[in-house]
């Protein structure tokens, strides 16, 4: 039951995270005009990965797409790539994890296959989250660098000194959405990897054989007392009278290749 819950929760958290990564990638507010020097501006600028926008005090908003590829900064292209890779990996991870969910029965899929798929999707979510966090962090670093470079300058115009304040940009809402979403996807991926361990198939147990000794009606099951392995094994010496049948909660997991990721 705990495995199913962990897997389900991991899926839901990753789903929310990937939805957030998609939202952040599409958002226009990656960088917003710094209003420190002019808090009552009548023209507000903000920029996204795909277009830049201007919102006027009148309420009129105009957005212009970046219709060039070669003319864009390499860093922006890198951020775009990281976010897209994150989305693609996350989407594939979601698709894989749907089939890996323990609560969903698909034909005669074995637990080992579900465990593999859970691990695969978990790794994909982790990489997806890392891509999003990396992309947002690169963009944030770019903003910080540009912010300090964009200081007000003075130049001499006709008729004396005329001041021009270069527009400075600071962190936009999309950055925070991206960081949180990337973190959620990462957490979801870790949860899927943890759930994978619980899904790993058990060692085959011998079929229980009942020996009816005279005067005693106790079933004897070879292998009924499993040696403690330290990986979720049942340490209580519990005699089993059910001939090997168990509930999902009692299923014990053993070390497998999936535990060492």
């Amino acid at each position: 039951m705990a495995v199913t819950a962990c897997q389900g929760l991991g899926f839901v958290v990753s789903l929310i995270g990937i939805a957030g990564i998609i939202a952040a990638t599409c958002m226009d507010q990656w960088s917003t005009q710094d209003l420190y020097n002019n808090p009552v501006t009548a023209v507000f600028n903000y920029q996204g990965l795909w277009r830049s926008c201007v919102r006027e005090s009148s309420g009129f908003t105009e957005c212009r797409g970046y219709f060039t590829l070669l003319g864009l900064p390499a860093m922006l292209q890198a951020v775009r790539a990281l976010m897209i890779v994150g989305i693609v990996l996350g989407a594939i991870g979601l698709l894989v994890s749907i089939f890996a969910l323990k609560c969903i029965r698909i034909g005669s899929m074995e637990d080992s296959a579900k465990a593999n798929m859970t691990l695969t999707s978990g790794i994909m979510f982790i990489v997806s989250g890392l891509c999003a966090i990396a992309g947002v962090s690169v963009f944030a670093n770019m903003l910080v660098t540009n912010f300090w470079m964009s200081t007000a300058n003075m130049y001499t115009g006709m008729g004396g000194m005329v001041q021009t304040v270069q527009t400075r940009y600071t962190f936009g809402a999309a950055l925070f959405v991206g960081w949180v979403a990337g973190g959620l996807t990462l957490i979801g991926g870790v949860m899927m990897c943890i759930a994978c361990r619980g899904l790993a198939p058990e060692e085959t147990n011998y079929k229980a054989v009942s020996y009816h000794a005279s005067g005693h009606s106790v079933a004897y099951k070879p292998g009924g007392f499993k040696a403690s392995t330290g990986f979720g094994s049942n340490t209580k010496n519990k005699k089993i009278y059910d001939g090997g049948a168990r509930t999902e909660d009692e299923v014990q997991s053993y070390p497998s290749k999936h535990d060492y990721v």
Partner: antibody
Framework: EVQLLESGGGLVQPGGSLRLSCAAS????????MSWVRQAPGKGLEWVAT????????YYADSVKGRFTISRDNSKNTLYLQMNSLRAEDTAVYYC???????????WGQGTLVTVSS | DIVMTQSPDSLAVSLGERVTMNCKSS????????????LTWYQQKPGQPPKLLIY???TRESGVPDRFSGSGSGTDFTLTISSVQAEDVAVYYC?????????FGQGTKLEIK
């Protein structure tokens, strides 16, 4: 047809109060940022205050800050300017205006005259 | 605050003549986000409210005759009337629409000789 009709002007003593109204019609009032602009007799134009659509952010000229309050009632399609602690230099024709692209004022009312005199 | 200075204060021209009036701002009105200049020109005829002529420094408002044109960028702007008509007698104001407080120039009075 877009129409802006100001009312509420008149003669008031220094230190007195007055409330100007601007009835708007012919457009979706709630979607537009609105402003008040004044013009003293024989003088140039002076921006007074602006109120945005939606969240209703307000902006004021330094000369009226703390004394004038711009507000709007979208249900009544009406813009207001509450003027307190009036001074002689507030004597002017007050125009109600609508903002459009470029923050330009594309429609103006006919104006209402406010005279502050003892 | 951005100070708007218009020149000349007044000018008298003959009908059909080309006229230019200037407006200078103390700070640049060019917005880097959309590369537009937030300067507006208004015409005010005697006894009437002002009328919008040009916004974004060079975009003519609908219904405004094409003899009116705006130009300039940054801090220096010009309003040109290619062929003055009798009905163009008015005071012309430029306005900063870039940052609050919105400020107007003192106006340029156009008269016919």
């Amino acid at each position: 047809e877009v129409q802006l009709l100001e009312s509420g002007g008149g003669l008031v003593q220094p230190g007195g109060s007055l409330r100007l109204s601007c009835a708007a019609s012919g457009f979706t009032f709630s979607s537009y940022t609105m402003s008040w602009v004044r013009q003293a007799p024989g003088k140039g134009l002076e921006w007074v205050a602006t109120i945005s659509s939606g969240v209703s952010y307000t902006y004021y000229a330094d000369s009226v800050k703390g004394r004038f309050t711009i507000s709007r009632d979208n249900s009544k399609n009406t813009l207001y300017l509450q003027m307190n602690s009036l001074r002689a230099e507030d004597t002017a024709v007050y125009y109600c205006t609508r903002l459009t692209k470029g923050n330009a004022m594309d429609y103006w009312g006919q104006g209402t005259l406010v005279t502050v005199s003892s | 605050d951005i100070v708007m200075t218009q020149s000349p204060d007044s000018l008298a021209v003959s009908l059909g003549e080309r006229v230019t009036m200037n407006c200078k701002s103390s700070q640049s009105l060019l917005n880097s986000g959309n590369q537009k200049n937030y300067l507006t020109w208004y015409q005010q005829k005697p006894g009437q409210p002002p009328k919008l002529l040009i916004y974004w420094a060079s975009t003519r408002e609908s219904g405004v005759p094409d003899r009116f044109s705006g130009s300039g960028s940054g801090t220096d702007f010009t309003l040109t009337i290619s062929s003055v008509q009798a009905e163009d007698v008015a005071v012309y104001y430029c306005q900063n629409d870039y940052s609050y407080p919105f400020t107007f120039g003192q106006g340029t009075k156009l008269e016919i000789k």
